[in-house]
């Protein structure tokens, strides 16, 4: 049905007028406006920055916004004793240092308040030692580093290269072997594109350049020292001690001059292979420790910065809903950054806002959602997800029995190359269909559909004809509303070449080289990639607020169960004799995904031909519907990880950025031929199989005919 | 227009101590690694310390190391060169020197430098 139907309202506001009201020279000067200074949480600049948003939501018609603040845990370096790394001589003289501060971009010299490049929540610390380069520092990198090589990073400083998995990760998996610090740097392999050049010349890092971030593993838990529960006024606090995810060695981030300088003197083992060789024209030697002429000297970090209970603030919109006001649609993206945020998140803001005065514009000539939309700032996003975990755990029970959907408004660009979705299956057809009526902003495109281009530059691996879409994993704000509360959950983006640009992320990503030039000379100066992905949030939105039926399809969700399924079936079936001896079948799993898919099927067949003028009957499908999501849900949530409750998807436990599916069984039978008693951890295979087999069948029946 | 502008010297005895100052302008001094360099009567140019963009690094002549520090205020867009244990062969006209653009270069002393001041002369003897 098209949209127009879902309120009483002049054909004339439908989704083409909500689109032809987004404007790129909009969305432009909301950059720059959001980009002159520092927005770190917690700090007055960012508070100010949120009543500038709260007034002009206002302005631009909103029902209602309103601040919702939290007194949460945040960490800062400290001003008059900066944070650094030394290499030390046999008489503890320090004859090398690396940087306090990156090199300001032109133009911002004389901006005050460029907090340091820093690994927020490192505890404080000055341990010495040898240094052992432990590659990306991933779960197989330790692997081999421990287990092939032999090499022992006891007692030692590591360090690690930035990319391929979550920082947080990094430091825990260093932490596990025994590590008495890591230091984190970025290789020119992973942040700096052949044949572009650095900034401000072009969108590559400088030297001098670092990627500051948390290197928390909070595991969804939000606030470390309110787990569960809202920071508000009279929460119970816990002890430092017992904080959640905190890091328990000191951790410091580098650039690729100062990296140069550590790398270059080590000695020990030589890489094992070229996938642990970056481009530094540096040996890559593993450690422990420098070579010949340098083996006597040490490395010495030196961290003094602080964590603090700090108050942060949330703006929270609403557009009330004309039918069903008790249904919500939430736009949610952060608006705090490490400094300027040219593209993290302010890229995703100015989005936001120019949506924001489009719905405003149509609610002014008196169109209403039929849905309630409500619209979110975030805060603390970069300390850990903090803005949106804690008002969602305030406001949990509503959003579980009144959350439709959530799309999440982070960054717009990281790339200017082709779209990028991560969402529930439950949206795949509402992606594929909203993109095939947008027209595509790339060049060779003129005239084709954003789905015609998407799927040209990003073909589905398995559907011939169809554009990839990803899991979502975790790393930003949708996180509590899909992996705890099991609202359907979506997030869209420009992107880069995956085939061409090997490096993680994009180079500047958290530098104080994030800037609005670095997105007017170089990423999207028309900012006609910015109001695509505008058209795609916002006509999401849109879509999900206004159509009478849910666009939610089912059956696309029975056939990723069975794609799941075979996956994690052909994992456990590299043990076969194990299979055997302990008795592990599958059966219920597969069983369970056929009955969700007739059953999905069904009820399908039902949504084409059941009476969308009965008002009880269309609410109850929209409600089947509605509620798939959460039936997904297990309320003991996943081992050791109660805040990631989602059966079929949670971040992996070896990347929080990345998802893995059927989670449970997964971590189960990773690296299970280790285990020192076999028998227990197939019975913890068996156990999750049939937590799986179970939420799938439940969920199923949901589908069911009511009675 | 760059300049780069010092003052400080004067005659000293050996022993003594002096502190040189560089005012700079037409640049943001935070952006780069700078030097002082001297010239003796009748010498070729010899460098005396570099310090990095951010401070973090400081290197020394062997001539003068433990007796001279450089230092610098980047929010006032000076740099400093404190002289202690002066020496007759320290006489020489004082230059403070623009090195690379830390964007491009990471301030070490094989970077070189581009510009420099007029000079202060700096006389120790007795």
């Known amino acids: 049905k098209s949209s127009n139907e879902a309120t009483n309202i002049t054909p004339k506001h439908n989704m083409k007028a909500f689109l032809d009201e987004l404007k790129a020279e909009n969305i432009k000067k909301f950059l720059y406006n959001f980009t002159q200074i520092p927005h770190l949480a917690g700090t007055e600049q960012n508070f100010q920055l949120a009543k500038q948003i709260q007034s002009q939501w206002k302005e631009f018609g909103l029902d209602s916004v309103e601040l919702a603040h939290y007194d949460v845990l945040l960490s800062y370096p400290n001003k008059t004793h900066p944070n650094y790394i030394s290499i030390i001589n046999e008489d503890g003289n320090e004859i090398f240092n690396t940087s306090l501060f990156e090199p300001p971009p032109p133009g911002y010299e004389n901006v005050s308040d460029i907090v340091p490049p820093f690994s927020a929540f490192s505890p404080q610390g000055m341990p010495e030692g040898d240094l052992v380069y432990v590659n990306y520092a991933r779960t197989e990198d330790f692997f081999k580093l421990e287990r092939d090589m032999k090499i022992n990073c006891s007692g030692k400083i590591v360090i690690a290269r930035y990319g391929k998995v979550f920082r947080g990760n990094k430091v825990k998996n260093a932490q596990l072997a025994g590590a008495k610090g890591v230091i984190l740097y970025s290789d020119p392999a992973d942040y700096f594109a052949p044949g572009v050049k650095s900034y401000p010349d072009g969108w590559n890092l400088p030297g001098g350049g670092v990627q500051r971030g948390n290197i928390l593993n909070l595991n969804g838990a939000g606030d470390p020292l309110t787990p569960g529960y809202p920071a508000n006024e009279y929460a119970y606090r816990r002890g430092i001690a017992e904080a959640v995810g905190l890091p328990s060695i000191p951790v410091h981030p580098i650039g690729y001059y100062d990296a140069q300088k550590l790398l270059e003197k080590m000695g020990g083992s030589a890489p094992p292979d070229s996938s642990w060789r970056g481009s530094l024209k540096v040996p890559y030697n593993v450690g422990p420790g420098f070579t010949g002429n340098f083996s006597t000297q040490k490395v010495k970090m030196h961290i003094h910065s602080t964590n603090e209970v700090t108050r942060i603030y949330n703006v929270i919109g609403t557009l009330r809903g004309a039918v069903e006001p008790d249904r919500y649609v939430i736009l949610g993206g952060h608006r705090d950054s490490w400094v300027f945020g040219g593209i993290d998140p302010q890229s995703g803001a100015a989005v936001v806002h120019e949506i924001v005065r489009s719905f405003g514009t149509l609610k002014k000539e008196g169109w209403r959602p039929r849905r309630t939309i409500l619209f979110a700032s975030w805060d603390a996003e970069e300390f850990g997800l903090l803005g949106s975990t804690e008002w969602a755990e305030e406001n949990s029970r509503l959003l579980q029995e009144r959350g439709v959907a959530y799309i999440n408004a982070d960054s717009s660009i990281e790339g200017n190359y082709t779209l990028r979705v991560d969402c529930t299956p439950l949206m795949y057809s509402l992606v594929h269909n909203l993109t095939k009526e947008l027209k595509s902003p790339d060049e060779g495109f003129e005239g084709k559909s954003l789905y015609e281009s998407w799927t040209k530059k990003s073909p589905s691996p398995e559907f011939s004809g169809m554009p990839r879409i990803s899991k979502l994993g975790s790393g930003n704000d949708f996180e509590v509303f899909f992996q705890r509360l099991g609202i359907a959950s979506g997030r869209a983006r420009y992107t880069k070449n995956w085939e061409t640009n090997k490096f993680s992320g994009y180079p500047l990503y958290h530098s104080v080289y994030e800037t609005y030039e670095l997105v007017e000379k170089f990423y999207d100066p028309m900012f006609k990639y910015h109001l695509t992905v505008a058209q795609v949030r916002g006509g999401m939105v849109f879509e999900l607020a206004n159509s009478i039926v849910l666009p939610f399809d089912c059956r696309d969700y029975a056939v990723v169960l069975r794609k799941y399924a075979d996956k994690i079936y052909s994992i456990s079936m590299k043990h076969p004799q194990e299979m055997k001896t302990y008795s592990v079948s599958f059966d219920s799993l597969f069983s369970a995904v056929k009955n969700f898919t007739e059953i999905a099927s069904k009820f399908s067949e039902r949504l084409q031909d059941f009476d969308k003028s009965n008002p009880i009957v269309l609410r109850m499908m929209n409600d089947q519907l509605m509620f798939l999501e959460r039936a997904f849900i297990d309320p003991l949530g996943l081992p050791d990880r109660p805040f990631y409750r989602h059966v079929i998807y949670a971040p992996s436990s070896h990347n929080k950025y990345a998802g893995e599916s059927f989670p449970g069984i997964y971590d189960a039978l990773f690296d299970i031929e280790s285990k020192v008693d076999p028998s227990k951890a197939w019975g913890e295979v068996k156990r999750q199989i049939y937590v799986a087999a179970f939420t799938v069948q439940a969920a199923a029946e949901t589908l069911s005919e009511v009675a | 227009e760059v300049q780069l502008v010092e003052s400080g010297g004067g005659l000293v005895k050996p022993g003594g101590s002096l502190r040189l100052s560089c005012a700079a302008s037409?640049?943001?001094?935070?952006?780069?690694?700078m030097y002082w360099v001297r010239q003796a009567p009748g010498k070729g140019l010899e460098w005396v310390a570099v310090?990095?963009?951010?401070?973090?690094?400081?290197n020394y002549a062997d001539s003068v190391k433990g007796r001279f520090t450089i230092s610098r205020d980047n929010s006032k867009n000076t740099l400093f060169l404190q002289m202690n244990s002066l020496r007759v062969e320290d006489t020489a006209v004082y230059y403070c020197a623009k090195g690379g653009n830390a964007l491009y270069s990471s301030g070490w002393p094989d970077d070189g430098f581009d510009i420099r001041g007029q000079g202060t002369m700096v006389t120790v003897s007795s």
């Open positions: 037409g640049f943001n001094l935070i952006s780069y690694g």
């Open positions: 310090i990095s963009y951010d401070g973090s690094n400081k």
